[in-house]
């Protein structure tokens, strides 16, 4: 079992760009998590 205690949202915005010529979207990073502001110096969300 992993001992990771927190997720790791990037400190910058995740990208969300439509793929050219299709109706699908492309994402990067931890796009599926809630976009909550982490405390300074931390990647933690509650």
């Amino acid at each position: 079992v992993s001992s990771v205690q927190t997720p790791h949202l990037p400190t910058h915005a995740d990208s969300q760009t439509p793929s050219a010529g299709t109706d699908t979207q492309t994402f990067s990073g931890s796009a599926a998590n809630a976009k909550l502001n982490p405390t300074p110096g931390s990647n933690a969300i509650s």
Epitope: S2, T26, F27, S30, N33
Partner: antibody, heavy 116, light 109 residues
Framework: QVQLVESGGGVVQPGRSLRVSCEAS????????MHWVRQAPGKGLEWVAV????????FYADSVKGRFTISRDNSQNTLSLQMSSLRAEDTAVYYC?????????WGQGTLVTVSS | KIVMTQSPATLSVSPGERATLSCRAS???????LAWYQQRPGQAPRLLIY???TRATGIPARFSGSGSGTEFTLTISSLQSEDFAVYYC??????????FGGGTKVEIK
């Protein structure tokens, strides 16, 4: 502590349906994207599906698109995968995993065997 | 779709030695969103490294990740008995789909 517990696996005939579930505890479930990842016997890992933290977006691997449906109930801290038109190649251990795009916690998995 | 290729498929190493595992992407992984997982026999995978080089909480310092673009490396500085396992890389720089490498089995020499 974070816990993910899968259930619902078993033996099913080709063409039939099965629903597997994942019960989450130890964290705020509604803040996290959730995934299903599978592993065929003796093989590597294959991402199956993701659902956004709030259920607003769902995406699937091409191999299961149109046959599998991912869903979540944030009031019950549960994740589900409804599998239909099952094929022999869907035989695998199915893991639920937490994360926005990578997977920081995994359940222990539930085995789905598709066989006549 | 970004295809991830790991090499070698099997790595035979003696305890205490260094192991270097390679992961190559078919196109550049934006943001260096590359993760490494360890899977011991009969167990679920465990996150080791995310963002190409950041150790997950509780992961020993002997595990380190490096690389950028299309070439990434996981290094285990001094192999312990519990480190003999299969290791997978995974990109989350452009998805869906999220894609894994085929794995590298680290076995006792």
């Amino acid at each position: 502590q974070v816990q993910l517990v899968e259930s619902g696996g078993g033996v099913v005939q080709p063409g039939r349906s099965l629903r597997v579930s994942c019960e989450a505890s130890g964290f705020t479930f509604s803040n996290y994207g959730m995934h299903w990842v599978r592993q065929a016997p003796g093989k590597g890992l294959e991402w199956v599906a993701v659902i956004w933290y709030d259920g607003s977006k769902k995406f699937y691997a091409d191999s299961v698109k149109g046959r599998f449906t991912i869903s979540r109930d944030n009031s019950q801290n549960t994740l589900s995968l409804q599998m239909s038109s099952l094929r022999a190649e869907d035989t695998a251990v199915y893991y639920c995993a937490r994360g926005g795009g990578d997977f920081d916690f995994w359940g222990q998995g539930t085995l789905v065997t598709v066989s006549s | 779709k970004i295809v991830m290729t790991q090499s070698p498929a099997t790595l035979s190493v003696s305890p205490g030695e260094r192991a270097t595992l390679s992961c190559r992407a078919s196109q550049s992984v934006s943001g260096n969103y590359l993760a490494w997982y360890q899977q011991r026999p009969g167990q679920a995978p465990r996150l080791l490294i995310y963002g190409a080089s950041t150790r997950a909480t509780g992961i020993p310092a002997r595990f380190s990740g490096s690389g950028s673009g299309t070439e990434f490396t996981l290094t285990i500085s001094s192999l312990q008995s519990e480190d003999f396992a299969v290791y997978y890389c995974q990109q989350y720089g452009k998805w869906p789909p999220l894609t894994f490498g085929g794995g590298t089995k680290v076995e006792i020499k």
